[in-house]
């Protein structure tokens, strides 16, 4: 179980630098993003992590009223701050594991 | 209503350090991220560092980095300004900033304090 | 970092004048520009957000247009207490929150 979670921590890891350059990879995250509502993988400070994301801005998938550029510029109460690796691997223990 | 009100301003020689502060009121503190802004005299507004509503990220702009940290005390509704190594051209009248974020821009600016560093 | 430049510097005008202000950005930035009025001894004033919203307490008679990379300030017809200086402002890619020059607006 916790190798399992090892490997979906890295994993997210992982995309989350892909996130900028590959769509697929990107939809992917933000549908996880959106559906367990949370943002990055320890919490939503690891998009700031990522060299090719601006530093001011998350994917609008982590916006708790998502439209279209809500993650520039954001204000910390306009976002989910938990993480994901946490949240869904909760959920994963609970359901799948 | 919203309040910002600097403090700790001051003359200072080259090389040594001052801490401003800055009093909000009227407002819930942690909805806002804040800034530090300032204006050398006679010249035009510069930005010189923000912090988020928890303190988590924090940004200073390349003319202050390695010297001056922007810290915040959410119990006391209080912002700082930790100015270190200061110079002649850090003078100027610095200004604690409210910030929405988003696009909606700083709304609500204190009245100002003014540091001069001098010999 | 993104840069703004404004122009005119500054300009003379006179009560009642019609007059616009300038911005560019050095590259686009959306509509995530702001614009503020600064009078003498006093700290600036937020007039207008994202481009073209009113700020709230704001006369009707500033208004802002453009977006990407070219904005404009227009005040439709200047009162006596519209002379100050005007800045405008991007915060859609930061750090660092970049400022215009300025423009100083003189009575004629």
């Known amino acids: 179980r916790d190798k399992v979670m090892s490997e979906f921590n890295n994993n997210f890891r992982q995309q989350m630098e892909n996130y900028p350059k590959n769509n697929h990879t990107a939809s992917i995250l933000d549908r996880m993003q959106a559906d367990f509502k949370c943002c990055g993988a320890a919490n939503y400070t690891d998009w700031e992590k990522i060299p090719s994301m601006s530093k001011n801005r998350v994917p609008d998938s982590c916006c708790i009223n998502v439209t279209v550029g809500c993650g520039i510029n954001f204000n910390e109460k306009a976002i989910h701050k938990e993480g994901c690796v946490e949240k869904i691997g909760g959920w994963l223990r609970k359901n799948v594991l | 209503q919203v309040q910002l009100v600097e403090s700790g301003g001051g003359l200072v020689k080259p090389g040594g350090s001052l801490r401003l502060s800055c009093a909000a009121s009227g407002f819930t503190f942690t909805d806002y991220f804040m800034n530090w802004i300032r204006q050398a005299p006679g010249k035009g507004l510069e930005w010189v560092s923000y912090i988020s509503n928890s303190g988590a990220i924090k940004y200073q702009a390349d003319s202050v980095k390695g010297r001056f940290t922007i810290s915040r005390d959410n119990a006391k509704n209080s912002l700082y300004l930790q100015m270190n190594s200061l110079r002649a051209d850090d003078t100027a009248v610095y200004y604690c900033?409210?910030?929405?974020?988003?696009?909606?821009?700083?709304?609500?600016w204190g009245q100002g304090t003014l540091v001069t560093v001098s010999s | 970092d993104i840069q703004m430049t404004q122009s005119p510097s500054s300009l003379s005008a006179s009560v009642g004048d019609r007059v616009t202000i300038t911005c560019r950005a050095s590259q686009s930035i959306r509509n995530f520009l702001n614009w503020y009025q600064q009078k003498p001894g006093k700290a600036p004033r937020l007039l207008i957000y994202a481009a073209s919203s009113l700020q709230s307490g704001v006369p009707s008679r500033f208004s802002g247009g453009g977006s990407g990379t070219d904005f404009t300030l227009t005040i439709s017809s200047l009162q006596p207490e519209d002379f100050a200086t005007y800045y405008c402002q991007q915060s859609y890619s930061n750090p660092p929150i970049t400022f215009g020059q300025g423009t100083r607006l003189e009575i004629k």
């Open positions: 900033v409210r910030d929405p974020r988003s696009y909606y821009g700083f709304d609500y």
